[in-house]
Interface confidence: medium
């Protein structure tokens, strides 16, 4: 079941709960981090446990055999169920900004496409309380900054309208 | 508006440490990193590194990591690089510059600071 | 480290003419690049970021292109306060390296 660290707003689905395949990788971030970029899959949205146990699952397949990586890219990925899911979690480097912002950052990525409609209140809530919990436990500055992914990189990504949105959020600072 | 205050130049005796100072103003000095940057007379750019005044978070070049120290001091707002054991070749322009916002390309760039490592 | 190689080393133009600068990376950068224009005496200034992306202040007739490890600087009709040093950055990885640098002079 999920995991709820008493400094978190939102559980967190471990690995194993959504059955991913064991992670190869093995570059450490150096906590706590600057940094966090918002993406999102572009990919199906899911809005119960067992969907977005799938989503995330599809997602790691195609990153691991289709791109070659690791694991997911992702540190965390956000359901419109509500919950976290662990990708590489606080401690392990990701792929999903690059190589400059990868090692200084924690990637968090909405399962879904926000090109033309916002995440349910229920992922955004969660994802605002994986922040609590990053800088609640050490693995996020308190003075964090938030990226969204196309600030970083030239993507559309995180789509316009989860783009807009969390430029309204505290720690956005826009490129 | 964005602002970097550098002094126009430093006479060093060789291996006599020297400190170089960029007072910034017209911004939040906690908020974004300061970098340094080196210009040999007639050469190129080079970086040095990074300092984020916030925490002292610094990434430095590690080509400068036994020359060069970065601070700051957050009261005046001001950054500082300390050059240890100067020798000829470390006679240039300094400079300091502020990113855009991050890694987004040196915006605001200060004068400059011209060492000069001479007996 | 990556790095940065810019031709021509000098470019002789006459105001009006449209010049390109190249800037090649040793590996691919994305777009992770910047470039500068540093007049004598001067501190260099930011003229575009990200391979392509405009600065507020910077004249329209400077402009970039490319991606991956090839980019190019263009200045579609030079003014004779165009003269001086043109760099470019490597915005990538660390450490941030700038180019050799291309002098643009007036013929």
């Known amino acids: 079941q999920e995991t709820e660290d008493p400094a978190c707003c939102s559980p967190i689905v471990p690995r194993n709960e959504w059955k991913a395949l064991a992670s190869e990788c093995a570059q450490h971030l150096s906590l706590p981090l600057r940094y966090v970029v918002v993406s999102h899959t572009a990919g199906s949205s899911c809005n119960t446990p067992a969907s977005c146990q799938q989503q995330a699952r599809n997602v790691q397949h195609y990153h691991m055999k289709t791109l070659g990586w690791c694991d997911v890219g992702y540190n965390f990925l956000i359901g419109e169920d509500g919950l976290v899911y662990e990708g590489r979690g606080w401690n392990f480097t990701g792929a999903h900004s690059g190589h400059l912002w990868n090692p200084m950052s924690i990637g968090i990525s909405f399962m879904g496409n926000y090109m033309d409609r916002v995440p349910t209140p229920q992922a955004i809530r969660a994802a605002q309380g994986l922040l609590a919990c990053g800088v609640a436990q050490g693995a996020l500055r308190s003075n964090y900054v938030l990226k969204g992914h196309r600030d970083v990189q030239r993507t559309l990504s995180p789509g316009n309208q989860l783009y807009h949105l969390i430029q309204n959020w505290p720690h956005y600072r826009s490129p | 508006q964005v602002q970097l205050q550098q002094p126009g130049a430093e006479l060093v005796r060789p291996g006599a440490s020297v400190k170089l100072s960029c007072k910034a103003s017209g911004y939040s000095f906690t908020s974004y990193w300061m970098n340094w940057v080196k210009q040999r007379p007639g050469q190129g750019l080079e970086w040095i590194g990074m300092i984020h005044p916030s925490d002292s978070e610094t990434r430095l070049n590690q080509k400068f990591k036994d020359k060069a120290t970065l601070t700051v001091d957050k009261s005046s707002s001001t950054a500082y690089m300390q050059l240890s054991s100067p020798t000829s070749e470390d006679s240039a322009v300094y400079y300091c510059?502020?990113?855009?916002?991050?890694?987004?390309?040196?915006?605001?760039w200060g004068q400059g600071t011209l060492v000069t490592v001479s007996a | 480290d990556i790095v940065m190689t810019q031709s021509p080393a000098t470019l002789s133009v006459t105001p009006g003419d449209r010049v390109s600068l190249s800037c090649r990376a040793s590996?691919?950068?994305?777009?992770?690049l910047h470039w500068y224009q540093q007049k004598s005496h001067e501190s260099p200034r930011l003229l575009i970021k990200y391979a392509s992306q405009s600065i507020s202040g910077i004249p329209s007739r400077f402009s970039g292109s490319g991606s991956g490890s090839d980019f190019t600087l263009s200045i579609n009709s030079v003014e004779p306060e165009d003269v001086g040093v043109y760099y470019c950055q490597n915005g990538h990885s660390f450490p941030l390296t700038f180019g050799t640098g291309t002098k643009l002079e007036l013929k």
């Open positions: 590996q691919s950068i994305s777009d992770y």
């Open positions: 510059a502020r990113d855009y916002s991050d890694y987004d390309g040196f915006a605001y």
